[in-house]
């Protein structure tokens, strides 16, 4: 019968001829009366056999990631008779792995959106690298993830690639962050190969800023001939938030005379001071009113940012009109 051990050949061997092992018949007494032949894909080009001894050699550099095993056939013939000594047999040559592939992030580019002020531990995104080396061969494809850029705001779980928030962030200070993640094979041991990826993390707005008046004091004038409903001027607050979180409502906080009103222009986010009652210069020609401004939408959990509405004082001077 045939005698052989399992055949392995390391990939990427640079030698011109690498001895893999020996194929022989147990009838072979070593007197060179038998001839060994190799058949199948790779026979003669990738692998050769010593016809007399049955020794098998790899004569080409192999790449496991291209092809990890070869199935060949062996024959042994009695030279004298030309007859097969053993039935033709199939055997396998396995290409063994070396760590010749770095981890690669295949789903690039990575982008994630997370609300500003999210608590520590909030999951942002998971990045995954793949390594073409053999996962069953030692640590060649066992990866560890680490953060090269992004501290102190982000952290990455070493074995999963899950990125989490490690420090609260304020969109109004910085609205996006570039995080660089490294994946290293060999679980970080010497000889490890690595790959990196960038993750763009954008902060979405939450309503953590209340509107604040641009001026603590405004001065407006109104003619005593102005009819009720007249717009006598505008006031304006600013809000560092954006979109719906910056929508505001103006109102009167204090007007003993009940002469004025404030309406909100929701397109410009300005407050428009309106004459509610006609004024009479001879009766009163100086008014003072206090206005306040609040956000339109404030979720309950964000109310802590909206205690005490911003206020402004408006001095209104009545202009005299000569009466007939």
């Amino acid at each position: 019968g045939w005698v052989w051990n399992q055949f392995f050949v390391p990939e990427e061997m640079n030698t011109t001829s690498h001895h893999i092992g020996q194929l022989r018949s147990d009838l072979d007494n070593g007197n060179n009366s038998f001839q060994y032949k190799l058949l199948g894909a790779g026979a003669g080009s990738t692998f050769i056999i010593d016809e007399r001894t049955g020794d098998i050699y790899a004569i080409q550099k192999l790449d496991r990631e291209e092809r990890s095993l070869y199935i060949l056939r062996a024959q042994v013939i009695d030279i004298a008779t030309g007859r097969a000594v053993e039935p033709e047999s199939e055997f396998v040559i396995k290409v063994s792995d070396i760590n010749d592939n770095e981890p690669k992030f295949l789903d690039e580019p990575y982008e994630a959106i997370v609300p500003e002020m999210s608590p520590e531990g909030t999951l942002v995104i998971q990045v995954t690298a793949s390594d073409a080396d053999d996962p069953s061969s030692g640590n060649n494809a066992r990866l560890l993830y680490s953060l090269l850029q992004g501290q102190p705001y982000f952290s990455v779980e070493p074995t999963t690639g899950v990125i989490r928030i490690s420090s609260k962030m304020d969109r109004e200070l910085q609205d996006e962050y570039w995080v660089i993640i490294q994946a290293k094979d060999m679980i970080g041991q010497p000889g490890a190969l690595s790959g990196t990826t960038s993750v763009l993390i954008k902060l979405s707005d939450v309503n953590d800023n209340k509107p604040i008046f641009k001026e603590s004091l405004y001065r407006l004038t109104v003619s005593e001939s102005a009819p009720t409903g007249t717009s006598i001027g505008t006031i304006m607050a600013y809000d560092n938030d954006i979109g719906e979180n910056a929508e505001m409502d103006y109102s009167i906080e204090e007007d003993d005379s009940q002469t004025f009103d404030i309406i909100t222009n929701h397109e410009t986010q300005e407050g428009i001071v309106i004459l509610k009652k006609k004024v009479d210069f001879e009766h009163q020609n100086h008014y003072g009113i206090r206005a306040k401004v609040k956000n339109h939408h404030v979720p309950e959990q964000l109310m802590k940012y909206h205690t005490e509405a911003s206020t402004t004082f408006i001095k209104i001077q009545v202009e005299d009109v000569d009466e007939p």
Epitope: E215, S216, L217, Y218, R219, T221, E254, D256, S257, E282, H283, Q284, N285, H286, Y287, G288, R290, F313, K315
Partner: antibody, heavy 120, light 107 residues
């Protein structure tokens, strides 16, 4: 802290024009919403508001003095001025400049006052 | 114009006593448009109260203001030696007018 300082002649002849200047320091006369007033106090008597000006030049005067009073402003010098024409002995008084408040038309800041005597 | 009348003209009290000064307007004024000042000899008036019960910056809490309509009051809860001087009320709704003053002197 806003400070105001009056300056001008302490003696004016009858029928002439009294001229005083108020220099503002520690704040801009162009601050939005503030009015700059002149107020006087006859010797041993009460206070009388003369008029005010806004940094834009808009002025408003006490109706009883309106025909004789002009208040002007010079934002580049951070000053405002009072001119009172055709003075008589009844215009002898301590003249104060003042700025109104951030929550109303009351007088929050005052100069120390300057005595102007009308006499020949 | 709105005329302000202050009473009494002179108030004689001892240190530690409570002083109640009155200011009456010739017609209704909104309470938001009245102020009180203190004036010491040779000095400019100093704002005490505005609107009519808000204390100006740096004013001790023994000074308080109240009132509405035509009747307003300045109260000094416990007179200190430096409080013996002249007090004026002022309205700032219809132009600007001052009361004639109340002198608080030591009994």
């Amino acid at each position: 802290q806003v400070q105001l300082q009056e300056s001008g002649p302490g003696l004016v002849k009858p029928s002439q024009t009294l001229s005083l200047t108020c220099t503002v320091s520690g704040g801009s006369i162009s601050s939005s919403g503030y009015y700059w007033s002149w107020i006087r106090q006859h010797p041993g008597k009460g206070l009388e508001w003369i008029g005010y000006i806004y940094y834009t030049g808009s002025a408003y005067y006490n109706p009883s003095l309106k025909s004789r009073v002009t208040i002007s402003v010079d934002t580049s010098k951070n000053q405002f001025s009072l001119k009172l024409s055709s003075v008589t002995a009844a215009d002898t008084a301590v003249y104060y400049c003042a700025r109104d408040g951030s929550s109303g038309w009351y007088f929050q800041y005052w100069g120390q006052g300057t005595l102007v005597t009308v006499s020949s | 114009e709105i005329v302000l009348t202050q009473s009494p003209g002179t108030l004689s009290l001892s240190p530690g006593e409570r002083a109640t000064l009155s200011c009456r307007a010739s017609r209704n004024i909104s309470s938001s448009y009245l102020a009180w000042y203190q004036q010491k000899p040779g000095q400019a008036p100093r704002l005490l109260i505005y609107g009519p019960s808000s204390r100006a910056t740096g004013i001790p809490d023994r000074f308080s203001g109240s009132g509405s309509g035509t009747d307003f009051t300045l109260t000094i809860s416990r007179l200190e030696p430096e409080d013996f001087t002249v007090y004026y009320c002022q309205q700032y709704g219809s132009s600007f007018t001052f009361g004639p003053g109340t002198k608080v002197d030591i009994k």
